[in-house]
Amino acid sequence: SGVFQLQLQEFINERGVLASGRPCEPGCRTFFRVCLKHFQAVVSPGPCTFGTVSTPVLGTNSFAVRDDSSGGGRNPLQLPFNFTWPGTFSLIIEAWHAPGDDLRPEALPPDALISKIAIQGSLAVGQNWLLDEQTSTLTRLRYSYRVICSDNYYGDNCSRLCKKRNDHFGHYVCQPDGNLSCLPGWTGEYCQQPICLSGCHEQNGYCSKPAECLCRPGWQGRLCNECIPHNGCRHGTCSTPWQCTCDEGWGGLFCDQDLNYCTHHSPCKNGATCSNSGQRSYTCTCRPGYTGVDCELELSECDSNPCRNGGSCKDQEDGYHCLCPPGYYGLHCEHSTLSCADSPCFNGGSCRERNQGANYACECPPNFTGSNCEKKVDRCTSNPCANGGQCLNRGPSRMCRCRPGFTGTYCELHVSDCARNPCAHGGTCHDLENGLMCTCPAGFSGRRCEVRTSIDACASSPCFNRATCYTDLSTDTFVCNCPYGFVGSRCEFPVGLP
């Protein structure tokens, strides 16, 4: 689809005559008829196959034709066509005299023709005007012409329809040849595919507008190249979506179980050594002078009761100090200035002079101890009960309450599970810490040797001196068949031969 445009520029008819040579009265009121048709080597009359157009009266005799696009497109003249431009044409331009106002062909006398020109040739589509001038004996016509494509038609012959658009069926403008030219940020055959943010992952990301990167399910990050771990994954990562691969020191489905509490939380204080002992558990080994689960407590050196003879202990920055009672001295109040005359022994202790009366010693009654018999004996301090027995103070003595399976003063005796001879068929009983075990004789099995098993009595090779052994399956016993010169149930005795 396109338009053949003809621009009339100047018509000269100085004598004001018709083609017949007769003059126009009072002058030649001139209008034009244009016929555009297919190419003919010799332009002949006939249908104007590409179209016709007429002008109003443009002037008298000789005149220049003004450009007049505003007034209905009078000049240049427009000859639209709705087909592919063939590249060739024939053009007939007739100048006519209009005696009256009716310009219809049937209203004009045949001799009203002033001049007729016919041209033919090739014409390519383009913006440039071709200038031409045709001269006859009495007239001259100057004009120019061109073929341009209609709006939205492109290409060498105006055959390619292309409409610029900017919606989801395309984001493009049209090139002169009718091909699409994508707007920035768009690609694809119809410029319908946005160019995603540079680096946006091809599989895991997409976009609905340029420079965007939207992530498919399971992916995240600016470029959709980071997988999303399992929901609730605490200390783990993924290489594909919904995984939860635990970081070092973490375990469990969600990597939320702390297997390295020591490193992650540093719970031990005061330079203690931390040891992981399972999920979320640990043990602190304290440095000397500290105690507590996390070694958070500084040990008082007075806690070990270093002051003797009733001395009172005072903690100091660099240790401790004993405040001794009257009659005692020394770092731990271990030296006495008292003698037996001062009755230093408490709780009925008897005093004995030593070193010619310079010192003394107390002999304490039962249940009391200490250099002055000042301490009541806790008979359980030495934890004398074995095998987890519980020590109970009972006045002057103590007793051990034993755990099941143990007996004796100190729970030192294991109650024998073998006392009631539980092993059948001569099985040997062995006491264990929590139960017993039977060692069964040949031919028997089971926890208590209660199951008889069929045995090969010859398996132990009971026959001597190359005797042949036979098993009696009914009694699970063997019989030895002795070689010549031997007797006995096992052929163990040689006989004197004559």
Partner: antibody, heavy 121, light 107 residues
Amino acid sequence: QVQLQQSGAELMKPGASVKLSCKVTGGSISSSSYYWGWIKQRPGHGLEWIGDIYYTGSTYYNPSLKSKVTITVDTSSNTFYIQLISLTTEDSAIYYCARQALAMGGGSDKWGQGTLLTVSA
Amino acid sequence: DYLLTQSPAILSVSPGERVSFSCSGQRLGDKYASWYQQRTNGSPRLVIYEDSKRPSGIPSRFSGGNSGDDATLSINSVESEDIADYYCQAWDRDTGVFGAGTKLELK
């Protein structure tokens, strides 16, 4: 031969929601050459474009219906859907699905048989 | 909102006549127009796309044009099977717009 097979007629109560389906057979819904659209036709009325979807999930809606509908696509089953919410009697219509071809300037060259939705108390 | 106006609402023809449907919209010639035929109780069918192109299977008696503010659909010689409603359609940005339709009936 590409065909669009729509789900059956629905009778719904006002205020309810409904989801209609359109299964594509004889071709892939994941083709980059098509959008997949929904068109509404009330009894005795003309056609009204509702919206469309690309295989990537990008959607476009008629502004006047945007709050009413959601269009989704399931490439694994070669099916696309329209969900209508807060139904009123105004939503009673035949709903057509269609294939909109980029090569045809957005013209709909294939249509489903239509699903009749009736909203009635 | 972009509006497509179809006229007339009803066209009465006799078989064999030439008929033209009109569809107008602001600068419609700068958009691609499509035309759909919908027979009674049937689904719409594309008969013209990109102003004047016919999909395969559409008879050559159907033709289209689009320039300025008007698109036209012509049926060169109407046959009884052409009796249907005809809708024009165009895209305004990202929204599809249909005309109200023209009913083609037999005289």
